[in-house]
Interface confidence: low
Amino acid sequence: EVEKTACPSGKKAREIDESLIFYKKWELEACVDAALLATQMDRVNAIPFTYEQLDVLKHKLDELYPQGYPESVIQHLGYLFLKMSPEDIRKWNVTSLETLKALLEVNKGHEMSPQVATLIDRFVKGRGQLDKDTLDTLTAFYPGYLCSLSPEELSSVPPSSIWAVRPQDLDTCDPRQLDVLYPKARLAFQNMNGSEYFVKIQSFLGGAPTEDLKALSQQNVSMDLATFMKLRTDAVLPLTVAEVQKLLGPHVEGLKAEERHRPVRDWILRQRQDDLDTLGLGLQG
């Protein structure tokens, strides 16, 4: 906290401009009116304030708006957003997509911070729903955000958003989430040819039903074992030995190393020994 001191004569700020970068912290505290700051927040980012000076400006806004900043101020926070704590952000009511975009832009290129996670939570609560525009914005900044949504929230994700998703963004998705995302991915990629389609759909196959796995087995896709191990057990069980052999192609030999793990273990137990023997891997049903 900055000690309360009177503003020196002639130093009272009439507007937020570059002259303020020469003010000491106590001078900013004493000479900048919080209401003036609030109405001219859009100028702050154009001025090379130090982090210490920004702390003072934040303190002034906190005093002016103890119940939380209005959206007119929030939209123009810019780099001052990086000074906010999740506790600060929980007081906000953010409803404008422009405000959300402006603040996500500040954090662009960085991982999702607790501040950003709280901001998004406040925004979604303020809007009352996850509409297409919101989801397009969030997936553009954080494709991995999909996996932090509940299956119910994911149901409103437009298939067009799926194109932004990279394989690593789905690493943390639960089976229930993939159950919702897979049909959307299938729809999004439906006009691609066989090999390109498989490359795109591969990450989502943890939500694929048996009939789609059977169809893939007819397309020489050569699924790797890592992908196979993430498939739904109930989707794998009805597959025949011949279908699994076609699905995995040259990777079928990897079944031996995974024979004690689901879904391979459960699948083996469902097969006739004669059929397993045709693989020549020594699998015991």
């Epitope: 607790p114 996996c147 932090s148 943390t172 639960d174």
Partner: nanobody, 125 residues
Framework: QVQLVESGGGVVQPGGSLRLSCAAS????????VAWFRQAPGKGLEGVAA????????VYTDSVKGRFTISRDNSKNTLYLQMNSLRAEDTAVYYC??????????????????WGQGTTVTVSS
């Protein structure tokens, strides 16, 4: 009341190992997904590893795969993180978390209701 207490942090040289523990009390530990998160200096919170109550299908963030192992002992109400081949970029405050919100990803930072106070791991030569 629910309490999560982490321990096992410290200073270790690159390539070294540490084992973090998280002791839980005040909840039926065996029925909860539990996870490790970390926050490096000046960085955001990051999910490291998570283990569901079934103790199957553990999840790891890419940067620790093959080096870190998450495990749990339900009889002791304790979560562990075995960290091998430590690197400077593993330096962080490590937190355990539990009471996962239904439907959220196991490594989502907004996915847990209960958090520990953290234990500091410093990897430095």
């Amino acid at each position: 009341q629910v309490q999560l207490v982490e321990s096992g942090g410290g200073v270790v040289q690159p390539g070294g190992s540490l084992r973090l523990s998280c002791a839980a009390s005040g909840l039926s530990f065996s029925t909860y997904t539990v996870a490790w998160f970390r926050q490096a200096p000046g960085k955001g919170l990051e999910g490291v590893a998570a283990i569901p109550y079934t103790s199957q299908h553990m999840v790891y963030t890419d940067s620790v795969k093959g080096r870190f192992t998450i495990s749990r002992d339900n009889s002791k109400n304790t979560l562990y993180l075995q960290m091998n081949s430590l690197r400077a970029e593993d330096t962080a405050v490590y937190y355990c978390a539990t009471d996962r919100r239904p439907g959220t990803s196991m490594l989502a930072i907004n996915g847990y209701n209960r958090w520990g106070q953290g234990t500091t791991v410093t990897v430095s030569s």
